[in-house]
């Protein structure tokens, strides 16, 4: 109604002796600004005087004067909207009605607010969700209808008297609608929390106890089970009896059904807390557990592994692999079902016991032909010895052995002759099925293993044959020694070993691949000028002026042959390569080792390749190879290869030794 002043504030405020009250308040006057404000305690209207009687807690007039005793009560408002009040400290006798007497220029109003001050701090109130289930997160709420800026408080959660680890979220409200302090705790209860006491404790700023509220947790959970077995180790022999008992240590609500499972599958007609297995067989070995259900769901016990022991069954032998190739490794496996596992094995080769072989597996690292035959075994455990099974056959295959190439016609052979050769061998498994000849040619094979060469050429220098089954075995080549004029005459630099550079002593060799007859003469020339008649051309100290085009000639009684022109260049591929090691060739593990590839090359080396003692290339291409941290396993010989536009050069092996650190030695 338009003739009323409009106020907003909490209807009732709660506090206790010695605390404080903060009263959030807003108002709207009918006209103009507030000119006078009086705060009464339990005001009563006096009809005779047309005024309110009662204790005046606070008084403010136009001149703004406030009596000094009013410091406990503060008006924090203003002349047109805010009427917020504070009483600090608040006393028991402040309980009752507060009256806000407001006067503007022409209007008056009395607004009443209830104040409830208790002798001692009143308890907070814990709110729980309607149902709590194990491992499902719930929010616990603790609510206190109190908050005041001048009196800080805290709400602490305890479980069975011990502060809870989970972080609580505390919120406060000091508004015209509500005044409260609330603490919310997110919590995932376990079944073991069932029946436990949760406390919300109200404390002052120093942590001193003021009041509390408690509740008992009702945590719904699946049945918690313990399984017991007789005998306790669950190891029996065939024909023995076994008893398993299922005990419920906790269930909320009460359990309804019980069942037993073996290897995850439910056992029929087993719905009691005791499982009796009479005269067990080996098939009853497995993992057993009991399952008990309630309205929340099923609970399972831990698994009991029942082992039914029996003597080994007849054994079989598995060979990896047959047929086996000579030189390969073969493994024999004795397979026999038994519990406990066999502790001893006896192996037989062709019916004869193999001495010193008592393991489940027999490993032959390098198979030889005499290893072929029948292998069988017998398994043994504490309950007895099994029977020997049928055994398994090992077939050892190998390439043809001692292959030779034999020349059938008389020596010497001259260019144009007809030559007959045969290919012979000693033994073979499987049998020889074909022969191969090197080099290939358009030659006749009149019968298996025989080769006929019509009109033999100068270049038929050597012939080799191979006898083949699944593999080919090559004989050493035989020389035909066909007589012909010198062939493949070429200039070869024999000194220095690496590329030439100025000042070196240089020797050029006039080479030819072969000559029959062997008696020959040599001639050297450069730019048409005769230089010498020896097989070598020597320079004591080479100079750039010696560069040029060189040729040599070789004569025998059949004819003469000239080399191609050979260009002498004073350029060289990397040489004098060596691997140096820093800090030295002996380094302690965990430290750093730097290997440097040092070389002499023109043009300079463009990149390097590094190798280990097995000639395996390492993924580095620069001059330095850094191993950090270096390990004992890195010990070994390393070498490097340098490459430039002319060619490659390689170093000799350089050995790095990595020794154990004192720490490692101390641990051993």
């Amino acid at each position: 109604d338009s003739s009323k002043w409009v106020f907003e504030h909490p209807e009732t405020l709660y506090a206790w002796e010695g605390a404080c009250v903060w009263i959030p308040c807003t108002y709207r006057a009918l006209d103009g600004d507030l000119e006078s404000f009086i705060l009464f305690h339990n005001p009563e209207y006096n009809k005779n005087t047309s005024k309110f009687d009662g204790t005046r807690l606070y008084e403010s007039t136009k001149d703004g004067k406030v009596p000094s005793e009013q410091k406990r009560v503060q008006f924090l408002g203003d002349k047109n909207k805010n009427c917020t009040l504070s009483i600090h400290p608040v006393h028991l006798n402040d309980s009752g009605q507060l009256g806000l007497r407001m006067e503007s220029k022409t209007e008056k109003w009395m607004e009443r607010i209830h104040l409830n001050v208790s002798e001692r701090p009143f308890p907070p109130h814990i709110q729980l969700p309607p149902e709590i289930q194990e491992s499902q997160e719930v929010t616990l709420t603790c609510l206190l209808n109190f908050s005041c800026y001048g009196y800080p408080i805290q709400l602490q959660w305890l479980l069975e008297g011990v502060p809870m680890r989970q972080a609580a979220v505390t919120s406060t409200s000091l508004t015209i609608k509500s005044v409260f302090t609330r603490s919310e705790l997110k919590f995932s209860p376990q079944w073991s929390h069932h029946g436990k006491i949760v406390t919300c404790q109200l404390q002052d700023a120093d942590g001193k106890f003021l009041s509390n509220d408690t509740v008992q947790l009702n945590v719904k959970h699946t049945p918690k089970l313990e399984i017991k077995v007789t005998p306790s180790d669950a190891i029996v022999r065939e024909g023995d009896s076994v008893t398993m008992t299922c005990e419920v240590s906790s269930s909320n609500p009460e359990y309804t059904t019980v069942s037993w499972l073996k290897d995850g599958t439910s056992l029929k007609k087993q719905n009691t807390f005791t499982l009796n297995l009479r005269e067990v067989t080996k098939d009853q070995s497995g993992k057993y557990c009991c399952q008990v259900s309630n309205d929340v769901g099923p609970g399972r016990s831990e698994e009991v592994f029942l082992q039914v022991q029996y003597a080994p069954e007849p054994s079989t032998v598995q060979i990896l692999h047959s047929p086996a190739v000579e030189g390969s490794q073969v493994e024999f496996l004795c397979m026999s079902l038994a519990n406990p596992l066999p502790t001893n094995y006896t192996w037989y080769h062709n019916g004869k016991e193999m001495q010193g072989r008592t393991e489940e597996k027999v490993h032959i690292p390098k198979i030889l032909p005499w290893h072929a035959g029948t292998y069988s075994c017998v398994a043994e455990n504490i309950l007895g010895t099994g029977q020997r099974g049928p055994g398994a056959e090992l077939d050892v295959q190998y390439p043809p052995k001692k292959v030779t190439t034999v020349i059938q016609n008389p020596m010497p052979i001259r260019e144009g002759d007809t030559v007959t050769l045969s290919c012979n061998y000693n033994s073979s498994n499987p049998s020889v099925t074909r022969y191969e000849w090197k080099p290939h040619g358009a030659w006749e094979e009149p019968s298996l293993g025989v080769l006929k060469i019509q009109n033999v050429g100068w270049d038929n220098t050597t012939i080799a044959c191979a006898a083949c089954n699944s593999w080919c075995s090559w004989a050493s080549p035989v020389a035909l020694n066909v007589q012909y004029a010198p062939r493949d005459v070429r200039v070869r630099k024999i000194k220095p070993l690496s590329e030439i550079h100025s000042g070196n002593s240089v020797s050029l060799q006039c080479d030819f691949s072969s000559s029959h007859p062997k008696e020959v003469q040599f001639f050297w020339e450069k730019n048409g000028r005769l230089l010498g008649k020896e097989s070598q051309l020597n320079f004591d100290s080479i100079s750039p002026e010696d560069a040029g085009s060189y040729s040599c000639w070789v004569n025998n009684s059949i004819g003469q042959t000239a080399s191609k022109a050979w260009t002498l260049e004073v350029l060289y591929a990397p040489r004098r390569l060596r691997v140096s090691m820093s800090p030295g060739d002996q380094v302690m593990e965990g430290k750093s080792a730097t290997l440097t590839c040092e070389s002499d090359a023109n043009p300079p080396v463009s990149h390097y390749t590094w190798f280990d003692w097995n000639n395996q290339s390492l993924p580095y291409h620069s001059q330095k190879l850094r191993l950090e941290p270096v390990k004992v396993q890195h010990s070994g010989a390393y070498w490097c290869q340098g490459t430039n536009s002319v060619g490659k050069g390689r170093s000799p092996l350089s050995t790095l030794t990595v020794y154990y650190s004192p720490e490692t030695i101390g641990r051993r």
Epitope: S606, H607, L618, P619, Y620, G636
Partner: antibody, heavy 121, light 107 residues
Framework: QVQLQQSGPGLVKPSQTLSLTCAIS??????????WNWIRQSPSRGLEWLGR?????????DYAVSVKSRITINPDTSKNQFSLQLNSVTPEDTAVYYC????????????WGQGTMVTVS | DIQMTQSPSSLSASVGDRVTITCRAS??????LNWYQQKPGKAPKLLIY???SLQSGVPSRFSGSGSGTDFTLTISSLQPEDFATYYC?????????FGGGTKLEIK
């Protein structure tokens, strides 16, 4: 064909250890013609090689100087995989982490893992 | 450490254009230079190894050249799927290092 499959957490707290695994299919971690690398990528650092493990006649490791004191790369021959451990991480270690194969024939990273975004926070 | 400097850092081009990206090493790395392509949210993909060898399955419009310290990647005729970031990488010595990348954008 060769594939690399990465696994490991995407969030690591500062000062803790970052652990990632790279499972290899179609090749062997013990190959004597390959090296197995870890590389990371962040807006501030770009692509950054962290280190590698490889087998020739024995196992070798190379590490970048920037992480040398904190990094371990280990092969696991039984599972045909290799792993990265980076200790004492800071927010500067936040990046996408890749594993990659480097083959002798090309000396290049020819096969890469799918990448794992790791945030240090 | 060997520093790898790529230029330009970004490049705008149109489909059908011929594009060249350069990479410079702070010291000679012979021909141990590789090129990669990376698209957002994906791992880098090998395009060129050993400076000029085309990785199997990579279109022939990509080519690489150079040795020593200066290298180039050329795309002869840009296709829509080629817009990505390109990186060079040296495998000459450890630590293995990458260039800062060149972002190729549609003009």
């Amino acid at each position: 064909q060769v594939q690399l499959q990465q696994s490991g957490p995407g969030l690591v707290k500062p000062s803790q250890t970052l652990s990632l695994t790279c499972a290899i299919s179609g090749d062997s971690v013990s190959s004597n013609s390959a090296a197995w690398n870890w590389i990371r990528q962040s807006p501030s650092r770009g692509l950054e090689w962290l280190g590698r493990t490889y087998y020739r006649s024995t196992w070798y490791n190379d590490y970048a100087v920037s992480v040398k004191s904190r990094i371990t790369i280990n092969p696991d021959t039984s599972k045909n995989q290799f792993s990265l451990q980076l200790n004492s991480v800071t927010p500067e270690d936040t990046a996408v982490y890749y594993c990659a194969r480097e083959v002798s024939g090309t000396s290049a990273f020819d096969i890469w893992g799918q990448g794992t975004m790791v945030t240090v926070s | 450490d060997i520093q790898m400097t790529q230029s330009p850092s970004s490049l705008s081009a149109s489909v059908g254009d011929r594009v060249t990206i350069t990479c410079r090493a702070s010291q000679s790395i012979s021909s141990y230079l590789n090129w990669y392509q990376q698209k957002p949210g994906k791992a880098p993909k090998l395009l060129i190894y050993a400076a000029s060898s085309l990785q199997s399955g990579v279109p022939s419009r990509f080519s690489g050249s150079g040795s020593g310290t200066d290298f180039t990647l050329t795309i002869s005729s840009l296709q829509p799927e080629d817009f990505a970031t390109y990186y060079c990488q040296q495998s000459y010595s450890t630590p293995l290092t990458f260039g800062g990348g060149t972002k190729l954008e549609i003009k």
